[in-house]
C-alpha cells in the first residue's frame, strides 16, 4: 500500500492510473467504502463523503488514463486509506495528515519557552526533528519544547515529521521579542547632550504597549523613574517625565531619549522596560552613562569620571603629544603644578580611547580655559 504524507491546510493529489490511455469508469472511495468521486460518462460525480466540497479530480487528463483525487485544505481527519477502483483493479493509498503548531503565540519574549505540538492521526507514530535558525537540533514526539528563547532563535524553524520512511516538512516563523542589545554604555563629557537609543530586534505591523526608564544614579541612594511612556501603533507618547533631568523622547521608533546635559549627578545606570500589549512579561535593556569632567583649581589639574566603569579601564592625564603624566585604574587622577599647554584626560580600554576631555592650562599668571 502506497503511503502519502500531507500537511494540514495543504493540498494533496493522489494518483490513479489506468493501463488504457482513455477515459474509462473510475471511482475513489474511502476505507468505509463511501464513494468520494468518480465519473459517469464524461462528467464528475460526487458521493456523500465528508470531503465533498474539498475533493476534485483533473477532468482534462481522464482521456489519458489519469484519474487523480485532489483534496484541498487537508484536515487531520482526512487521514484514511483511499481506494481507486478502475479497470477491475483497486489501487490503495494511505493518506496521513499532520499538523504542527506553536501552542502559544509565535511572537515570544526573550527568555520565554516555545512549545511545538504535533497533530497526528490515530495509530500513527511519527518522530519530529526541528532545526532552529541558529542550527540547533531538537527532537521529540508529539511535543517539542525549547526553554529560554534567545534572540538568535528568531526566524524560520524547520521541522521534519518522519513516518513510514516518508517525511513531511513544516516551517514555522518565530519572532523573539527583544531589544537588539541587552546593555549599552554611553560615554560623555560633562555638559554634552546625551542620546540613548533602544532599537528593537523585531518588526511587527502594530506595536502597542507601555514603558518606563528607571535610573540609579551613582551618587543617589535609590533609583527613580525618569520617564514613563505609551506606545500605540509604533507612535510614542510621553506620560510622565521628571523635572530633573528633563528628558525628551522621540515620537517614533526606535525608542530614543535625549538628556540635554551630561552631569556627574546623572552618571549611573538605567533599566528601560517595555510591556507589550497581550504579552506577559517585559522587554528589558540596561543603559549606562559615564560622565567625565576635567578641572583646574589653583595648582591642581583633576580628571574625574562618574558612572559604571569596569576596573580594567585606565584614566590618564597627559600633555598633548607627550607621554601620560599620570595613568591609573581609578576614577580620579590629578597633576599638581601642571605645566602650560593643552592637557588631555583620557578614559581608555586596552589602548582604545572611550572618552576624551581637553583642558588648556595657561601660564600661572592666567586663569584656565576649558575648550
Amino acid at each position: 500500500k502506497k503511503v502519502v504524507l500531507g500537511k494540514k491546510g495543504d493540498t494533496v493529489e493522489l494518483t490513479c492510473t489506468a493501463s488504457q490511455k482513455k477515459s474509462i469508469q473510475f471511482h475513489w472511495k474511502n476505507s468505509n467504502q463511501i464513494k468520494i468521486l468518480g465519473n459517469q460518462g464524461s462528467f464528475l460525480t460526487k458521493g456523500p463523503s465528508k470531503l465533498n466540497d474539498r475533493a476534485d479530480s483533473r477532468r482534462s487528463l481522464w482521456d489519458q488514463g489519469n484519474f487523480p483525487l485532489i483534496i484541498k485544505n487537508l484536515k487531520i481527519e482526512d487521514s484514511d486509506t483511499y481506494i481507486c477502483e478502475v479497470e477491475d483493479q483497486k489501487e490503495e493509498v494511505q493518506l496521513l495528515v499532520f499538523g504542527l503548531t506553536a501552542n502559544s503565540d509565535t511572537h515570544l519574549l526573550q527568555g520565554q519557552s516555545l512549545t511545538l505540538t504535533l497533530e497526528s492521526p490515530p495509530g500513527s507514530s511519527p518522530s519530529v526533528q526541528c532545526r532552529s535558525p541558529r542550527g540547533k537540533n531538537i527532537q521529540g514526539g508529539k511535543t517539542l519544547s525549547v526553554s529560554q528563547l534567545e534572540l538568535q532563535d528568531s526566524g524560520t524553524w524547520t521541522c521534519t515529521v518522519l513516518q513510514n520512511q516518508k517525511k513531511v516538512e513544516f516551517k514555522i516563523d518565530i519572532v523573539v521579542l527583544a531589544f537588539q542589545k541587552a546593555s549599552s554604555i554611553v560615554y560623555k563629557k560633562e555638559g554634552e547632550q546625551v542620546e540613548f537609543s533602544f532599537p528593537l530586534a523585531f518588526t511587527v505591523e502594530k506595536l502597542t504597549g507601555s514603558g518606563e526608564l528607571w535610573w540609579q544614579a551613582e551618587r543617589a541612594s535609590s533609583s527613580k523613574s525618569w520617564i514613563t511612556f505609551d506606545l500605540k501603533n509604533k507612535e510614542v507618547s510621553v506620560k510622565r517625565v521628571t523635572q530633573d533631568p528633563k528628558l525628551q523622547m522621540g515620537k517614533k521608533l526606535p525608542l530614543h531619549l535625549t538628556l540635554p546635559q551630561a552631569l556627574p549627578q546623572y552618571a549611573g545606570s538605567g533599566n528601560l522596560t517595555l510591556a507589550l500589549e497581550a504579552k506577559t512579561g517585559k522587554l528589558h535593556q540596561e543603559v549606562n552613562l559615564v560622565v567625565m569632567r576635567a578641572t583646574q583649581l589653583q595648582k591642581n589639574l583633576t580628571c574625574e569620571v562618574w558612572g559604571p566603569t569596569s576596573p580594567k579601564l585606565m584614566l590618564s592625564l597627559k600633555l598633548e603629544n607627550k607621554e601620560a603624566k599620570v595613568s591609573k585604574r581609578e576614577k580620579a587622577v590629578w597633576v599638581l603644578n601642571p605645566e602650560a599647554g593643552m592637557w588631555q584626560c583620557l578614559l581608555s580600554d586596552s589602548g582604545q580611547v572611550l572618552l576624551e576631555s581637553n583642558i588648556k592650562v595657561l601660564p600661572t599668571w592666567s586663569t584656565p580655559v576649558q575648550p
Epitope: 502519502v4 504524507l5 500531507g6 500537511k7 495543504d10 493540498t11 494533496v12 493529489e13 494518483t15 492510473t17 462528467f43 464528475l44 476534485d56 479530480s57 483533473r58 477532468r59 482534462s60 487528463l61 482521456d63 489519458q64 489519469n66 487523480p68 485532489i70 484541498k72 513531511v168 516538512e169 516551517k171
Partner: antibody
Amino acid sequence: QVQLVQSGAEVKKPGASVKVSCKASGGTFSNYAFSWVRQAPGQGLEWMGIINPSGGSTSYAQKFQGRVTMTRDTSTSTVYMELSSLRSEDTAVYYCARDVGDRGMDVWGQGTTVTVSS
Amino acid sequence: DIQMTQSPSSLSASVGDRVTITCQASQDISNYLNWYQQKPGKAPKLLIYKASSLETGVPSRFSGSGSGTDFTLTISSLQPEDFATYYCQQSFSSPLTFGQGTKVEIK
C-alpha cells in the same frame, strides 16, 4: 503558504535549448502537479503541459510535443521545463504554476523571460 | 482543441462601475471554467474556479456564473486595483486553453 520561485532570465540563439527551473517552498512538493504556461510579448496565456506528482508522469500540449521535457526533483523540491530547437516565436515569459486540477492553477511562479535572438 | 472566446477584448470603466466579461467555449465544458486576473509584469492570479467558486482570499465583488458553453465574470463595484487583464481557462480537456483576454482600463 506555498511559494514558487523561478530561475532568472535567459537569452538563447535559435536552435538552442533552454531549461527553466521552478523551486517550491512552504508546502509538500511531492503531493502537487505543476503546469507550465507561457506568454509571448503582448499576447495571451498558452498552456504547455503538466507534470504529475507520482512518478513524474507528464502530459504535453500537442504543439510542444517532441520539443518540451518536464521533469521534477523531489530532493530539491524543483520542477524543470526544457524547451529545445528554439525559434524566435518562443520568446516569451514562462510561468510554472501549481495545478489543482479542476480547481485551476492556484499558485504561480514570478515568471522567467526567455529571449530567442540571433 | 477547445477554443475559448472572450468578449469584449477591452473595456473602459470607472471606479464603482459594474463590469461583466463573457467567455464562450467551442463545445460543452460543463462547469470546468476558471477565471484569472493578470496585472502588467506580474503572474496571473486565480479568481474563480469551476465557473462560480470564489478562490480563497479573493474579494466577494468578484463572481462567476454559467455552465455548458457560456460563462460570465462579474465585478460588482470596480476598485482601482481591479484594472487588469482577465482570462478565462477551460479545464475540461487537454490541452488546457485560455481565452485571449479582456483588458479593463480606466475610463
